[in-house]
């Protein structure tokens, strides 16, 4: 099924000449699992453990994790083992750190707040860059002010509204009367003045199975840069795509299994069928990525009778680029994700 | 109902570039490519090249390569051909035409009303 | 010279039977490629005629017909028309080492009498 969590091995190599004799076994083969799947507590994925066996709760943030307790990928978690060397051994669940920006060439961290200049408070996430005004602009004073003009007060950031009567002299305006008006002008100026700014989908957190995309958006209601996430799946890791090549083709850039079918998450099922497309694979050294793709919105219904949505990446097209880098930096190919109107001879 | 609609006629010096533009309305990029085609006065109609979305990239006619560029713009839902170097030759009519992102669909659906471009010396 | 080949024109007169023959390579029709046709009537953009050897778009009347054989393919029309007077093109799609390409036909002009 297509947002089924794919079962993930973690394969950490140790730096050579360092003691791994004592890193435990997490995993047991032949696979001991109890006769039933546990029930995890709201918002907690149910997935495959890293042992490819059982049923497991993921490990949430600040959780310990091993080869075998694995991290949600529904929440964009990583195994981090820093804290256990040599051994490598048991992590803490961490979040993925975001990039950092750079706006008009100074580099900020991710997380970071700053003021480019004194009319915007901007923040960077996760290598966007989302600004909040800081000048709320009133609407222009109506009727009573026949030449209303916006000027630049010395020793004041924010420009102000003017009146030029009749005497062409200007002066500062005042509204005639305080009622909800001036609550409700404020709200609209607020969004009259709001930098709508959308980033990018992150690539894909996998290169197979059940992944994470990120992206920052401030198209809200306080026009404050926020998270959005969704779902993909670049392709299953359960088919061998190279096998589906046609003779004296280099690449299968799409794959779309003939069967339609419902996407899991968690254990709950998609409340309608899919006939999804996938990325394919190329026989060079070449990847294939997202080239036209949409965000669509998937009901899920769980098996309790509760029901839920997620954002699913959908692709249409897949454009096979000239390199491949580690499938497990997910970052690597912010560095060159083709634009949609870039990509050409 | 899909339409294209196309960049008005041109009139260029040879060794000059022309970009042609092509709207698509009742669709979106998203679901289909534009590819292009071109017929010079009283001849046939010569591929020049689109996305293939097989191959997963975008692919020229053998007589264009180095020369002609195609992009897509999925904000606007408008796409470009480039051609550079231009030679009397180049002389023709140039048509948009889109191809559903469909395994196996290799043939256009529909026709933008075509750009003639003129090269004069 | 196109990859592949069509004959430069046909005709016949109304009421008749008429054919378009198109003949490609091992590395398009005979590559298991659909072929398309397309109609050019004068001083207008090409039209979707046949697509999938034999599929004919809505609002194409059932007097066209497509069948594809090997490494050739054939557009039939009955009942000739005076409108039929036009241009008419194949199309597929080859696949070779050198790379991907839509090839057409050279074009037959379909002459009514």
């Known amino acids: 099924t297509a947002l089924s969590p794919a079962p993930t091995t973690m394969d950490f190599t140790p730096a050579p000449l360092e003691d791994t004799s004592s890193r435990p076994q997490f995993c047991k083969w032949p696979c001991e699992c109890p006769p039933s799947p546990p029930r995890c507590p709201l918002g907690v994925s149910l997935i495959t453990d890293g042992c490819e066996c059982c049923k497991m709760c993921a490990q949430q943030l600040g959780d310990n994790c091993t080869e075998a307790a694995i991290c949600d990928p529904h929440r964009g978690l990583y195994c981090d083992y820093s804290g256990d060397r040599p051994r490598y051994a048991i992590g803490v669940c961490a979040q993925v750190v975001g990039v950092g920006c750079v706006l008009d060439g100074v580099r900020y961290n991710n997380g970071q707040s700053f003021q480019p200049n004194c009319k915007y408070n901007c923040t960077c996430i996760d290598g966007a860059v989302g600004c909040t005004p800081l000048c709320l602009r009133v609407r222009p004073p109506r009727l009573w002010c026949p030449h209303p003009r916006r000027v630049s007060i010395p020793g004041h950031c924010c420009e102000q509204w003017v009146c030029e009567d009749d005497a062409k002299r200007p002066r500062k305006t005042a509204p005639r009367d305080t009622g909800a008006f001036d609550a409700v002008g404020e709200v609209e100026a607020w969004h009259r003045n709001c930098i709508a700014y959308t980033s990018p989908w992150s690539p894909c957190s996998t290169s197979c199975g059940l992944g994470v995309s990120t992206r920052i958006s401030n198209v809200n209601a306080q026009c404050w840069p926020e998270q959005e996430s969704r779902l993909c799946n670049l392709r299953p890791c359960d088919v061998d795509i190279h096998t589906l090549i046609k003779a004296g083709k280099k690449c299968l850039a799409v794959y779309q299994p003939e069967a339609s079918m419902n996407f899991t998450l968690a254990g709950c099922i998609s409340t309608r069928s899919y006939q999804p497309k996938y990325c394919g694979v190329c026989m060079d050294n070449r990847c294939c990525i997202p080239y036209k793709s949409k965000t669509i919105d998937v009901s899920f219904q769980c098996p309790d009778g509760l029901g839920f949505s997620r954002q699913v990446l959908w692709i249409n097209a897949c454009f096979c680029n000239l390199s491949c880098r580690n499938p497990n930096d997910i970052f690597a190919d912010l560095e060159s994700y083709p634009d949609f109107s870039e990509i050409a001879n | 109902e899909v339409q294209l609609v196309q960049s008005g006629a041109e009139v260029k010096r040879s060794g000059a570039s022309v970009k042609v533009s092509c709207k698509l309305s009742?669709?979106?990029?998203?679901?289909?490519?534009i590819h292009w085609v071109r017929q010079a006065p009283g001849k046939g109609l010569e591929w020049m090249g689109g996305?293939?979305?097989?191959?997963?990239?975008?692919v020229y006619g053998d007589k264009f390569k180095g020369r002609v560029t195609v992009t897509e713009d999925p904000s606007t839902d408008t796409a470009y051909m480039d051609l550079k170097r231009l030679t009397f030759e180049d002389t023709a009519i140039y048509y948009c035409a889109t191809i559903k992102d469909i395994p196996g669909r290799y043939y256009f659906d529909f026709w933008g009303q075509g750009t003639l471009v003129t090269v004069s010396s | 010279q196109s990859v592949v080949t069509q004959p430069p024109s046909v005709s016949g007169a109304p009421g008749q039977r008429v054919t378009i023959s198109c003949t490609g390579s091992s590395s398009n029709i005979g590559a298991g490629y659909d072929v398309h046709w397309y109609q050019q009537l004068p001083g207008t953009a090409p039209k979707l005629l046949i697509y999938?050897?034999?599929n004919r778009p809505s609002g194409v009347p059932d007097r066209f017909s497509g069948s594809k054989s090997g490494t050739s393919a054939s557009l039939a029309i009955t009942g000739l028309q005076a409108e039929d007077e036009a241009d008419y093109y194949c199309?597929?799609?080859?696949?070779?080492?050198?790379?991907?390409?839509?090839?057409f036909g050279g074009g037959t002009k379909l002459t009514v009498l």
């Open positions: 009742g669709d979106t990029l998203t679901d289909l490519s």
């Open positions: 199309q597929s799609y080859d696949s070779s080492l050198s790379g991907s390409n839509w090839v």
């Open positions: 999938g050897n034999s």
């Open positions: 996305f293939d979305f097989e191959d997963g990239e975008i």
